[in-house]
Interface confidence: low
């Protein structure tokens, strides 16, 4: 197993309706043909995977589960799109990204993006 | 509906393993994560561990993560937690349930599962 580097943004914060977006940029050594990209979600000292997806270079992601994740992939790039957040939800999301497939095995683990979710405020009653 | 009734909970050495399953019915089983939590007497709900609707990704408590192993058959629509090296602090009612939304969240609050079953005894003996 060799170490990569990953970058991801420190803090994003989601959108109103609980979508929070950011990017995975994975520092290859080689050309890898299949990287799999898995999220982890770190909170209240334990950590637990949001979502994975393995693909083909140039192909889209398709995660597992009728998951709550969606993304595309460029070049060394992953563009993450988390959906359904709640205020409950926040926490550190950390991108973490294998690179399966020609050998070698390589495996890079990101600092975490933090994202706040803030649950929206009901609608006060309007008279038009 | 969906109705979770689990079993395999008794009583077991300190070190010793259990296997506790639960079996479901329900059409909509297989779509939707499940998870374990557990109560202990005189104390609240804990989340145990909870597993992905195709087995694929799972999420454990600190307390128990390296000696529990959460698991499911979908063919037999059941769901299991292989408990090993077990302590006397895992002594509780171990319920089985199913997060009332599809897809993979993990979460740890109860409130976010909405099928429960009964619960099966596991007292683990110093």
């Known amino acids: 197993c060799k170490a990569m580097h990953v970058a991801q943004p420190a803090v994003v914060l989601a959108s109103s309706r609980g979508i929070a977006s950011f990017v995975c940029e994975y520092a290859s050594p080689g050309k890898a043909t299949e990287v799999r990209v898995t999220v982890l979600r770190q909170a209240d000292s334990q950590v637990t995977e949001v979502c994975a997806a393995t693909y083909m270079m140039g192909n889209e992601l398709t995660f597992l589960d009728d998951s709550i994740c969606t993304g595309t992939s460029s070049g060394n790039q992953v563009n993450l799109t988390i959906q359904g957040l709640r205020a409950m939800d926040t926490g550190l999301y950390i991108c973490k990204v294998e690179l399966m497939y020609p050998p070698p095995y390589y495996l890079g683990i990101g600092n975490g993006t933090q994202i706040y979710v803030i649950d929206p405020e009901p609608c006060p009653d309007s008279d038009f | 509906e969906v109705q979770l009734v689990e079993s395999g909970g008794q009583l077991v050495q300190a070190g010793g393993s259990l296997r506790l399953s639960c079996a479901a019915t329900?059409?909509?089983?297989?779509?939707?994560?499940l998870g374990w939590f557990r109560q202990a007497p005189g104390k609240e709900h804990e989340f145990v561990a909870a597993?992905?609707?195709?087995?694929?990704?799972?999420a454990y408590a600190d307390s128990v993560k390296g000696r529990f192993t959460i698991s499911r058959d979908n063919a037999k629509n059941t769901v299991y937690l292989q408990m090993n090296n077990l302590k006397p602090e895992d002594t509780a009612v171990y319920y089985c349930?199913?997060?009332?939304?599809?897809?993979?969240?993990?979460?740890?609050?109860?409130?976010?599962?909405?099928?429960w079953g009964q619960g099966t005894q596991v007292t683990v003996s110093s």
């Open positions: 349930a199913r997060h009332h939304s599809v897809g993979w969240r993990a979460s740890h609050h109860l409130s976010d599962y909405d099928n």
């Open positions: 329900g059409r909509t089983y297989n779509s939707y994560s």
């Open positions: 597993i992905s609707a195709s087995g694929t990704l799972r």
